[in-house]
């Protein structure tokens, strides 16, 4: 599934509306390992990879395409 990297750059959003903090309004139990799709405003967050949202930490995470590394998959992996 590529390299998964995480970044603390977030405003606590889970569902895509600036005024919402969806994690505070859902009844689900927050267990590590639960990923959700990143809200729409993160559409271009991952440069060379797929964005997914870490529900337990409310942070965007990038699953990098092969050959790319970095918090936002912005760097070429020279060892690839």
């Amino acid at each position: 599934d590529g390299n998964s990297t995480r970044s603390p750059e977030t405003n606590g959003l889970l569902c895509g509306d600036p005024e919402e903090n969806c994690a505070a309004t859902t009844t689900q139990s927050k267990r590590k390992g639960h990923f959700s799709r990143c809200p729409k405003q993160y559409k271009h967050y991952c440069i060379k990879g797929r964005c997914r949202f870490v529900v337990a930490e409310q942070t965007p995470s990038c699953v990098c395409d092969e050959g790319y590394i970095g918090a936002r998959c912005e760097r070429v992996d020279l060892f690839y």
Epitope: T26, H34, F35, S36, R37, K40
Partner: antibody, heavy 120, light 106 residues
Framework: EVQLLESGGGLVQPGGSLRLSCAAS????????MHWVRQAPGKGLEWVSS????????FYADSVKGRFTISRDNSKNTLYLQMNSLRAEDTAVYYC?????????????WGQGTLVTVSS | DIELTQPPSVSVSPGQTASITCSGD??????VHWYQQKPGQAPVLVIY???DRPSGIPERFSGSNSGNTATLTISGTQAEDEADYYC?????????FGGGTKLTVL
């Protein structure tokens, strides 16, 4: 071929229980979140429940919360919906659907549906 | 909770363009997906992520989403496009469907 096949529907009395199954084939079941969606006769689509890829988190519509339980067995490539305290308004065709990826995307594969009729 | 509102019915002549709307508060900030359902059949995804088309779906199907309205457009509508169409989005961690639109090809 990617396929979802529901089973377990039928006629049940109000207050009764039923367990639906959805057998998945043709893809890596454990990579995908799964969902149940229902459609009452002549009505539109209504989301029922969702479960993440490993079964650790589940989500329900208010209309079924506390009565229905979604689960999955990744070793059997099967999704389940345990329905208790059934009501007449639960009468519908129940579809299982695959999430494109881990959770929160779109429903790219649907089963053919299984009819649940709640009536005395 | 977000509500998605669709017109109950839309009529179009063969070869003409059909537009089906899906309205909801600030829906442009969410991804919207569209499903086609023919009588007695399961729904089929025809547009995802506002405007992307799955493989196997004809090019005449397109979508847009901005502000409070998402739109499914069928250009050069054919008789086989007659069906019910549903929009869908996520609200918090729940799935929301529009009420559906019956497209009639006259």
């Amino acid at each position: 071929e990617v396929q979802l096949l529901e089973s377990g529907g039928g006629l049940v009395q109000p207050g009764g229980s039923l367990r639906l199954s959805c057998a998945a084939s043709g893809f890596t079941f454990s990579d995908h979140a799964m969902h149940w969606v229902r459609q009452a006769p002549g009505k539109g689509l209504e989301w029922v429940s969702s479960i993440v890829y490993d079964g650790s988190n589940t989500f329900y519509a208010d209309s079924v919360k506390g009565r229905f339980t979604i689960s999955r067995d990744n070793s059997k490539n099967t999704l389940y919906l345990q329905m208790n305290s059934l009501r007449a308004e639960d009468t519908a065709v129940y579809y299982c659907a695959r999430d494109y990826l881990d959770f929160g995307y779109y429903f790219d594969v649907w089963g053919q549906g299984t009819l649940v009729t709640v009536s005395s | 909770d977000i509500e998605l509102t669709q017109p109950p019915s839309v009529s179009v002549s063969p070869g003409q363009t059909a537009s089906i709307t899906c309205s909801g508060d600030k829906i442009g900030k969410k991804y919207v997906h569209w499903y086609q359902q023919k009588p007695g059949q399961a729904p089929v995804l025809v547009i995802y992520d506002d405007s992307d088309r799955p493989s196997g779906i004809p090019e005449r199907f397109s979508g847009s989403n901005s502000g409070n309205t998402a739109t499914l457009t069928i250009s050069g509508t054919q008789a086989e496009d007659e069906a019910d169409y549903y929009c869908q989005a996520w609200d918090m961690q729940s799935v929301v469907f529009g009420g559906g639109t019956k497209l009639t090809v006259l």
